[in-house]
């Protein structure tokens, strides 16, 4: 059974990726964003379920998508560089998986532009969050 | 990490037919197009045709239409490329390489040589 | 079909040069360009996507500009590692082409 301070974690790091992610969509919805219309082209795959953390094998698949359509923005709409960016909620998504168990993702068949994937993922962080609080 | 890893080269007699596969690991399969291109000794590369591993569609480089088939194995993560109706400038190595909308092709093969000799 | 042109087909450069490389696609392809690098014996490698977002891994030497029909690949300061054959790709629409290749010698 989960222990109080892994539950703390747990819910410390899903805000930690939340936070991130919202800084994602902030960045390139920022107005000074000019390739804003090139970046809403790209389809993203979203999860058929996403109900608990293992379904964040999802999240972590389309990651290396993500980091190369945020290279198209000017690097001065984000704090940190798209590839720092990815590389750390790549660790926090890591941890909060586990990589013990092997899930295999299963994707929607109706793919989604960069904003509704990040706020589908926001959506996710704050359902966990508010299951753990 | 992702890999693309292809069958081993080949020696086909003209007129026969040659499947070269692909094996992906690392992500999910169908998430990402299939590409084929060919490479003739010295030359340049020459697309060949695409599959998306998800929904099966292909599509080929009119110069191999009637000649090639794309197809997959999504429970084994492979995809296949048969070229039928061999000749001597058939001679080339093949390559695989994944793409996705305008990423390009971020992951290539390591290519296998088929020669066409009689 | 788009035909890419790529010049010059072959270019004699040293270490230290800058060197450009050009890309000439027959009808407008937006921003839908890639360069890749390949040496003998091994598969391309891709260097730039979209005409100039370089993916993490590349050398930040590289650099890739234009948009429409006329895109350039531009290596700021070449390294010994850098002599290898240099090819376009348009993937704004079927059938996909690449250029007829750039090959970078050691003058």
């Known amino acids: 059974a989960p222990t109080s301070s892994s539950t703390k974690k747990t819910q410390l790091q899903l805000e930690h990726l939340l936070l991130d992610l919202q800084m994602i969509l902030n960045g390139i919805n920022n107005y000074k964003n000019p390739k804003l219309t090139r970046m809403l082209t790209f389809k993203f795959y979203m999860p058929k379920k996403a109900t608990e953390l293992k379904h964040l094998q999802c999240l972590e698949e389309e990651l290396k998508p993500l980091e190369e359509v945020l290279n198209l923005a000017q690097s001065k709409n984000f704090h940190l560089r798209p590839r720092d960016l990815i590389s750390n909620i790549n660790v926090i998504v890591l941890e909060l998986k586990g990589s013990e168990t092997t899930f295999m993702c299963e994707y929607a068949d109706e793919t989604a532009t960069i904003v509704e994937f990040l706020n589908r993922w926001i959506t996710f962080c704050q359902s966990i969050i508010s299951t753990l609080t | 990490q992702v890999q693309l890893v292809q069958s081993g080269a080949e020696v086909k007699k003209p007129g026969a037919s040659v499947k070269v596969s692909c094996k992906a690991s690392?992500?999910?399969?169908?998430?990402?197009?299939i590409n084929w291109v060919r490479q003739a000794t010295g030359q340049g590369l020459e697309w060949m045709g695409w599959?998306?591993?998800?929904?099966?569609?292909?599509g080929y480089a009119q110069k191999f239409q009637g000649r090639v088939t794309m197809t997959r194995n999504t429970s084994i993560s492979t995809a296949y490329m048969e070229l039928s109706s061999l000749r001597s400038e058939d001679t080339a190595v093949y390559y695989c390489?994944?793409?996705?909308?305008?990423?390009?092709?971020?992951?290539w093969g390591q290519g296998t040589l088929v020669t066409v000799s009689s | 079909d788009i035909q890419m042109t790529q010049s010059p087909s072959s270019l004699s450069a040293s270490v230290g040069d800058r060197v450009t490389i050009t890309c000439r696609a027959s009808?407008?392809?937006?921003?839908?360009l890639g360069w890749y690098q390949q040496k003998p014996g091994k598969a391309p490698q891709r260097l730039i996507y979209?005409?100039?977002s370089l993916p993490s891994g590349v050398p930040s030497r590289f650099s890739g500009s234009g948009s429409g029909t006329e895109f350039t690949l531009t290596i700021s300061s070449l390294q010994p590692e850098d002599f290898a054959t240099y090819y376009c790709?348009?993937?704004?629409?079927?059938?996909?082409?690449f250029g007829q290749g750039t090959k970078l010698e050691i003058r």
């Open positions: 009808q407008g392809i937006g921003d839908d």
């Open positions: 790709l348009q993937h704004n629409s079927y059938p996909r082409s």
């Open positions: 979209s005409a100039s």
């Open positions: 390489a994944r793409g996705r909308q305008w990423l390009g092709f971020d992951y």
């Open positions: 599959m998306n591993p998800n929904s099966g569609n292909t």
């Open positions: 690392g992500y999910t399969f169908t998430t990402y197009d």
